[in-house]
Interface confidence: low
């Protein structure tokens, strides 16, 4: 066992003692969390589509409001949106956000104020006078305007419907277009008006498909679990060759999904980065944390992949088989 864990450590796989090492070869199902595990976990905004009246809510104003709202979010998508808005507006300063609420698996709501300063002072091309931009409605001259407070909702279809907004079929189709590519599409409503769609992509890790294929060829069932909607989840799963998908799973329900498989007599390995999945890592027969993950995940896991390489999941199972064979 010591030799096995030693060899693993030399290869960037930390196995916490003999028990997980002996368990690894019994694993019949590997459940991968999507964000940060199958994907890089560094989402980026791919598209901002304005849906409302551009004169009333021009792009810059939408970006200022959305960037401020999402700045209070700890969700990776929120971080990506805020980063994008800051870059596009050429500012590090945002407005004020109050009454912030985040509903896992749905979206956020809050009140945003003090964005006038951003719109007045954020970067603009030196050779393009502000007056030109005003004509286009892309930079309202709001320096002296009465500070406005915007009521903001950002999230999935369900979240906006729950808050009384109607989503037309063409907006839903635009979202579906992105979701079919494995992207996450979120909607933005300001003051009760649907005014934008943001498409966010998180690239799949290069080795993911090979890791999945190798596990399947070893007779291991591979499952994808995610809080994302079914279309996005299915698109990512298809890219990497996973057939079984648990989508729209709330963070608190990931443990239940692991238990569900265990109740069918399966030995389950859960692979995740610890964002929303630490309890599931602890519940699994073998919890595998990828090295870039959170401290909580590394604590909860039986195996830590220091190199953040999914092929090391395969390597740990191989190593377990070889070690157990030697012991016997």
């Amino acid at each position: 066992v010591m030799v096995g864990t030693g060899v693993a450590a030399q290869n960037g796989i930390l196995i916490k003692g003999g028990k997980p090492l002996e368990m690894a070869h019994k694993i019949k199902t590997v459940m991968f969390d999507k964000t940060g595990t199958i994907t890089h976990g560094v989402p980026r905004v791919m598209r901002v589509l304005l849906l409302g009246d551009v004169a009333t809510l021009p792009l810059r104003k939408v970006l200022a409001v959305v960037g401020t709202a999402e700045a209070s979010s700890e969700h990776p998508l929120g971080v990506a949106v805020t980063k994008y808005c800051k870059e596009e507006l050429g500012t590090e300063t945002l407005g004020y956000c109050t009454d912030f609420q985040a509903v896992p698996g749905c979206g956020i709501g809050c009140k945003v104020s003090n964005v006038e300063g951003i719109l007045a002072h954020s970067e603009r091309p030196l050779s393009a006078p502000a007056s030109h931009l005003n004509e286009a409605g892309s930079l309202p001259a709001e320096k002296d305007a009465v500070p406005q407070t915007f009521s903001v909702l950002i999230g999935n279809r369900e979240w906006l419907r729950r808050n009384g907004l109607t989503i037309s079929s063409d907006v839903s189709d635009a979202m579906t277009d992105h979701e079919m590519k494995g992207q996450t599409a979120i909607l933005v409503a300001i003051d009760g008006v649907l005014c934008g769609m943001i498409a966010i992509a998180d690239a799949v890790k290069q080795e993911a498909a090979l890791a999945v294929h190798t596990l399947q060829s070893m007779g291991v069932d591979v499952v994808l679990i995610t809080g994302d909607n079914r279309k996005t989840a299915r698109a990512i799963a298809t890219q990497v060759g996973i057939n079984k998908v648990f989508a729209e799973v709330l963070p608190s329900h990931k443990v239940a999904k692991v238990q569900e498989l265990q109740n069918k007599g399966k030995k389950v390995a859960m692979v995740g980065d610890g964002v929303n999945d630490s309890p599931a890592l602890a519940q699994a027969d073998m919890g595998v944390a990828i090295g870039t993950g959170t401290d909580v995940a590394i604590e909860a896991a039986d195996v830590v992949l220091i190199r953040n390489d999914l092929l090391d999941v395969v390597a740990s199972i191989h190593l377990s088989k070889r070690t157990v064979r030697r012991i016997r």
Partner: antibody, heavy 117, light 111 residues
Framework: CQSLEESGGRLVTPGGSLTVTCTVS????????IIWVRQAPGEGLEWIGS?????SAYYTSWVKGRFTISKTSTTVDLKMTGLTTEDTATYFC?????????????WGQGTLVTVSS | AQVLTQTPSPVSAAVGGTVTINCQSS????????LSWFQQKPGQRPKLLIY???TLASGVPSRFKGSGSGTQFTLTISDVQCDDAATYYC???????????FGGGTEVVVK
């Protein structure tokens, strides 16, 4: 009808400056990227830079401050300084969707810039 | 910075035949599929054929097919017509490209 049209291309002497303009119609610059691409005679397409919906601009590494992109409500200008014979090319502007990775779905017809003494 | 490398030019095809053009990206393109294909005829502007690696642009005949993911992409033209004689370019993202987001181009000669 949505379109882009380049103008301002002409013969310039080496070391000179020139501004070519991309005029758009039928859509709002506040929702799209505009990219500038050039094509030397018999050569491939070469990206120069991009102007974002908010007016932010990004350039290819060889530009080194010689070229500047700016925009108004309906035009995007490419100002070129310190021109050399190697800058002789047809200059195209093209539209990309609301992000930095959208495809270029609409192109202007191009304007020819000739740098020669 | 992303670099797109295309099949060396030119490629010959007979009318009614099939031609395949390859485009290799280093590193992989955004979201593994953020790649488009263009057709350009002499003296004309480029025309979008395929986006998202495999989605046919509006008005483009279904003879044109895009495939691939990550780093390897292919444009296949089946039932080649005389009108398909052109140079074909692949392209990736543009905002912070630093290097050229366009491939070097592949000339298709129809015999």
């Amino acid at each position: 009808c949505q379109s882009l049209e380049e103008s301002g291309g002409r013969l310039v002497t080496p070391g000179g400056s020139l501004t070519v303009t991309c005029t758009v119609s039928g859509f709002s610059l506040s929702s799209y990227w505009i990219i500038w691409v050039r094509q030397a005679p018999g050569e491939g397409l070469e990206w120069i830079g991009s102007s974002g919906p908010s007016g932010s601009a990004y350039y290819t590494s060889w530009v080194k401050g010689r070229f500047t992109i700016s925009k108004t409500s309906t035009t995007v200008d490419l100002k070129m300084t310190g021109l050399t014979t190697e800058d002789t090319a047809t200059y195209f502007c093209a539209r990309a969707g609301g992000s930095d990775y959208d495809w270029f779905d609409l192109w202007g017809q191009g304007t020819l810039v000739t740098v020669s003494s | 910075a992303q670099v797109l490398t295309q099949t060396p030019s030119p490629v010959s095809a007979a009318v009614g035949g099939t031609v395949t053009i390859n485009c290799q990206s280093s590193p992989s393109v955004a979201n593994n599929n953020w790649l488009s294909w263009f057709q350009q005829k002499p003296g004309q502007r480029p025309k979008l054929l395929i986006y998202g690696a495999s989605t046919l642009a509006s008005g483009v005949p279904s003879r044109f097919k895009g495939s691939g993911s990550g780093t390897q992409f292919t444009l296949t033209i089946s039932d080649v017509q005389c009108d398909d004689a052109a140079t074909y370019y692949c392209a990736g993202g543009h905002k912070t490209a630093e290097k050229n987001p366009f491939g070097g181009g592949t000339e298709v000669v129809v015999k």
